[in-house]
Interface confidence: medium
């Protein structure tokens, strides 16, 4: 850009792009300022005046530099079986996750609609596949030579201790009992745990300003004339009126 062109709005060089945190307004045919996170475009720029930004209202947010006419609504309040892991602020959406020991049993793009308690494997069964944010624990019978004596959503089957002389043979739900004071080999005392799933899924992630109308479209996919994220060149020749579609 020529050195004298420093302030928005300005006309870009032919074939040129707007600078960081600016966008090209199709109507004004000028490079104009974007609004920072937590704000939105209250008045769009003209050839002689720059974008006028305004703070997001309560329960709305913008996470990126943008030129959207309205801030995005924060997601629904978290349900009773969820915890709010991130509050709704002007710059970020609310994030709800299922409580520890629970997972999301039914979800839509808007987030988890119903949390369910992770299955507990009963004695004689161990965790074959641990639970995740969106899937239940899978239990399996303990194979010969292994056991689980707990009711747990994290314990796996453990090998029986090996005895010099066996007092009571182990089975799927009980360890072997040795007559000698020390077995030749044993697992460390206590159950072996699989880690609990760490729930990080956002209930609502930042959607595009022109929301998807396709049922299967991910909330994260840019649809329509989305403002480019911070750091892009802003060379998007979209007009702000498109946002009202």
């Amino acid at each position: 850009l020529p050195a004298q062109v420093a302030f928005t709005p300005y006309a870009p060089e032919p074939g040129g792009t707007c600078r960081l945190r600016e966008y090209y307004d199709q109507t004004a045919q000028m490079c104009c300022s974007k609004c920072p996170p937590g704000q939105h475009a209250k008045v769009f720029c003209t050839k002689t005046s720059d974008t006028v930004c305004d703070s997001c209202e309560d329960s709305t947010y913008t996470q990126l530099w943008n030129w959207v006419p309205e801030c995005l609504s924060c997601g629904s309040r978290c349900s009773s079986d969820q915890v709010e892991t991130q509050a709704c602020t002007r710059e970020q959406n609310r994030i709800c996750t299922c409580r520890p020991g629970w997972y999301c049993a039914l979800s839509k793009q808007e987030g988890c609609r119903l949390c369910a308690q992770l299955r507990k494997c009963r004695p004689g069964f161990g965790v074959a596949r641990p639970g995740t944010e969106t899937s239940d624990v899978v239990c399996k019978p303990c194979a010969p030579g292994t056991f689980s004596n707990t009711t747990s959503s994290t314990d796996i089957c453990r090998p029986h201790q090996i005895c010099h002389v066996v007092a009571i043979p182990g089975n799927a739900s009980m360890d072997a009992v040795c007559t000698s004071t020390s077995p030749t080999r044993s697992m460390a005392p206590g159950a072996v745990h699989l880690p609990q799933p760490v729930s990080t899924r956002s209930q609502h992630t930042q959607p595009t300003p022109a929301p998807s109308t396709a049922p299967g479209t991910s909330f994260l996919l840019p649809v329509g004339p989305s403002p480019p994220a911070e750091g892009s060149t802003g060379d998007h020749h979209h007009h702000h009126h498109h946002h009202h579609h």
Epitope: L72, S76, L106, K108, R113, A116, H204, P215, F219
Partner: antibody, heavy 120, light 111 residues
Framework: QVQLQQSGAELARPGTSVKLSCKAS????????IDWVKQRTGQGLEWIGE????????YYNEKFKGKATLTADKSSSTAYMQLSSLTSEDSAVYFC?????????????WGQGTSVTVSS | DIVLTQSPASLAVSLGQRATISCRAS??????????MHWYQQIPGQPPKLLIY???NLESGIPARFSGSGARTDFTLTIDPVGAVDVATYYC?????????FGGGTKLEIE
């Protein structure tokens, strides 16, 4: 208390469009889904689709894609359904209903219905 | 799509007796111990009204003579005892997956 107030009866010509409205009150409009359901005279209920007004996200029954367009205006807490290229098959009563994001996952409050008659 | 088949299509019951309506799904509507099956009552000229949600939960304000049971593919709505105000059409509906679907309806009459 939760209320859904639907617009009045519509008489339309084949090939034209109508836009039905559903004004919500008594709860936070952007927190829950608005569903639309069709009922032809003497027939059962058919789910058209739903919109989440907080984001504008929509979910459609494949059968009604291209026929129904769901929108919502947060400022007036009103959901809309536009029916296009009307034929006699579209003559029916159309209901809007609220479905909470959490919990019941059922349509717990309904509008009174809007009758659409398509006739030349 | 999940197809819901209601039976019978119509039912005549004496006042004070029990009415039982069945709804069978073409595939399971269960997920993680929850059944996403609901029951609605529609009186002629009125919108449907939610009676039972998630198979067996009584909606607030609905009389206790209405109850729901079942799991996976087979569900039942029971009205016991039937009153004159219960003359209506009853629909089951699943919300396990899109598109949500309704049963064909069961018309309850008093004999």
């Amino acid at each position: 208390q939760v209320q859904l107030q639907q617009s009045g009866a519509e008489l339309a010509r084949p090939g034209t469009s109508v836009k039905l409205s559903c004004k919500a009150s008594g709860y936070t409009f952007t927190d829950d889904y608005i569903d639309w359901v069709k009922q032809r005279t003497g027939q059962g209920l058919e789910w058209i689709g739903e919109i989440y007004p907080g984001s504008g996200n929509t979910y459609y029954n494949e059968k009604f894609k291209g026929k129904a367009t769901l929108t919502a205006d947060k400022s007036s807490s009103t959901a809309y359904m536009q029916l296009s290229s009307l034929t006699s098959e579209d003559s029916a009563v159309y209901f809007c209903a609220r479905s909470q994001v959490y919990g019941k996952i059922a349509m717990d409050h309904w509008g009174q219905g809007t009758s659409v008659t398509v006739s030349s | 799509d999940i197809v819901l088949t209601q039976s019978p299509a119509s039912l005549a019951v004496s006042l004070g007796q029990r009415a039982t309506i069945s709804c069978r799904a073409s595939e399971s509507v269960d997920n993680s111990g929850n059944s996403f099956m609901h029951w609605y009552q529609q009186i002629p000229g009125q919108p449907p009204k939610l009676l039972i949600y998630r198979a067996s939960n009584l909606e607030s304000g609905i009389p206790a003579r209405f109850s729901g049971s079942g799991a996976r593919t087979d569900f039942t709505l029971t009205i016991d005892p039937v009153g004159a105000v219960d003359v209506a059409t009853y629909y089951c509906q699943q919300s396990k997956e899109d598109p949500y679907t309704f049963g064909g309806g069961t018309k309850l009459e008093i004999e």
